[in-house]
């Protein structure tokens, strides 16, 4: 199922992701950067271990995880954070716990596009990707 | 360990710039901002911007705009701030400061430059 | 820009006393973007205690942070006398990034 996900994307559109970001808390210096990046996002499987890498001139990140499995995070903005990634009707849901807060990405398909939602309180950001 | 290493002092006449420098060793040069502070004597501190290294993306505190340039050399791993036209409201100690991401503290801090104005 | 008002603006206290300073901001902040430093006389000032309530490196326990929104504080539980120093706290939610002007504590 997570065959569709596989392939290198890059970022096309972003919707509300600094309002995002600072729900999230994210400090001003690092929301202005991370919001002027363009990311590449790749996404591979081996066996039962999924991994998604962030390339950009902000910062690369890499993540490797078994379904449902918890595993430890640190994410592009510096925040470590537990994760856990379930597949939910073709949804990959991205639980992210830190300091006593918790948001949640989805990734999904849409048409020939991956879209990511980021989800923080009541804000949400749409990430839209295109094959690269 | 992370350290910022700074040059103790600089005497400069009023009018003239100044280039201040800052190395950075003991971490990945790229991965964090660099962000430069004021403090005059017997004062408080004061942002002046920061820059990320990985980009070259800048951003000044409006105050400082028409005053300092930030720029880096990544091959030495050095940001440099370039303060021009001098007068003796610029004589103060200027440190330069790691930013640690999300939070966005300064978390490492190299000794400050004390820079002096006068004829 | 964001203004941060620290008070008192200078205080003393004796070894053993518990010691509180405020940092009151001018609009509301996320917490994980409030930043407290201690200085010492000519030297450079160092992270105490960042996104409120998290002490930095080699900060002794008996100092605390806490607040919320346009309200903070650090605390020592038990004044020593190395803790003598200016404290400054810091805002990080917005540009531009400011600091309070500083409390200065001695020791009684």
């Known amino acids: 199922m997570c065959d569709a996900f596989v392939g290198t994307w890059k970022l096309v559109s972003s919707e509300n992701f600094d309002d995002y970001m600072k729900e999230v808390g994210v400090g001003f210096a690092t929301r202005k950067v991370a919001g002027m990046a363009k990311p590449n996002m790749i996404i591979s499987v081996n066996g039962d271990v999924i991994t998604i890498k962030s390339e950009s001139t902000f910062k690369n990140t890499e993540i490797s995880f078994i379904l449902g499995q918890e595993f430890d995070e640190v994410t592009a903005d510096d925040r470590k954070v537990k994760s856990t990634i379930t597949l939910d009707g073709g949804v990959l849901v991205h639980v992210q716990k830190w300091d006593g807060k918790s948001t949640t990405i989805k990734r999904k398909r849409e048409d020939d596009k991956l879209v990511v939602e980021c989800v923080m309180k009541g804000v949400t950001s749409t990430r839209v990707y295109e094959r690269a | 360990q992370v350290q910022l290493q700074q040059p103790g002092a600089e005497l400069v006449k009023p009018g003239a710039s100044v280039k201040l420098s800052c190395k950075a060793s003991?971490?990945?040069?790229?991965?964090?901002?660099i962000t430069w502070v004021k403090q005059r004597p017997g004062q408080g501190l004061e942002w002046i911007g920061d820059?990320?290294?990985?980009?070259?993306?800048?951003t000044n505190n409006e105050k400082f705009k028409s005053k300092a340039t930030l720029t880096v050399d990544t091959s030495s791993s050095t940001a440099y701030m370039q303060l021009s036209s001098l007068t003796s409201e610029d004589s103060a100690v200027y440190y330069c400061?790691?930013?640690?991401?999300?939070?966005?503290?300064?978390?490492?801090w190299g000794q400050g430059t004390t820079l002096t104005v006068s004829s | 820009e964001v203004v941060l008002t620290q008070s008192p603006a200078l205080m003393a206290a004796s070894p053993g006393e518990k010691v509180t300073i405020t940092c009151s901001v001018s609009?509301?902040?996320?917490?994980?973007?409030l930043h407290w430093y201690q200085q010492k006389s000519e030297t450079s000032p160092k992270p105490w205690i960042y996104?409120?309530?998290n002490l930095a490196s080699g900060v002794p326990v008996r100092f605390s942070g806490s607040g919320s929104g346009t309200s903070y504080s650090l605390t020592i539980s038990s004044m020593e006398a190395e803790d003598a120093a200016t404290y400054y706290c810091?805002?990080?939610?917005?540009?531009?990034?400011?600091f309070g002007a500083g409390t200065k504590l001695e020791l009684k």
């Open positions: 400061a790691r930013l640690r991401g999300y939070y966005d503290y300064f978390d490492f």
């Open positions: 003991g971490y990945t040069f790229t991965s964090n901002a």
């Open positions: 820059i990320s290294p990985g980009s070259g993306s800048t």
């Open positions: 609009s509301s902040i996320s917490s994980s973007n």
């Open positions: 996104g409120t309530s």
């Open positions: 810091q805002q990080a939610s917005h540009y531009p990034l400011t």
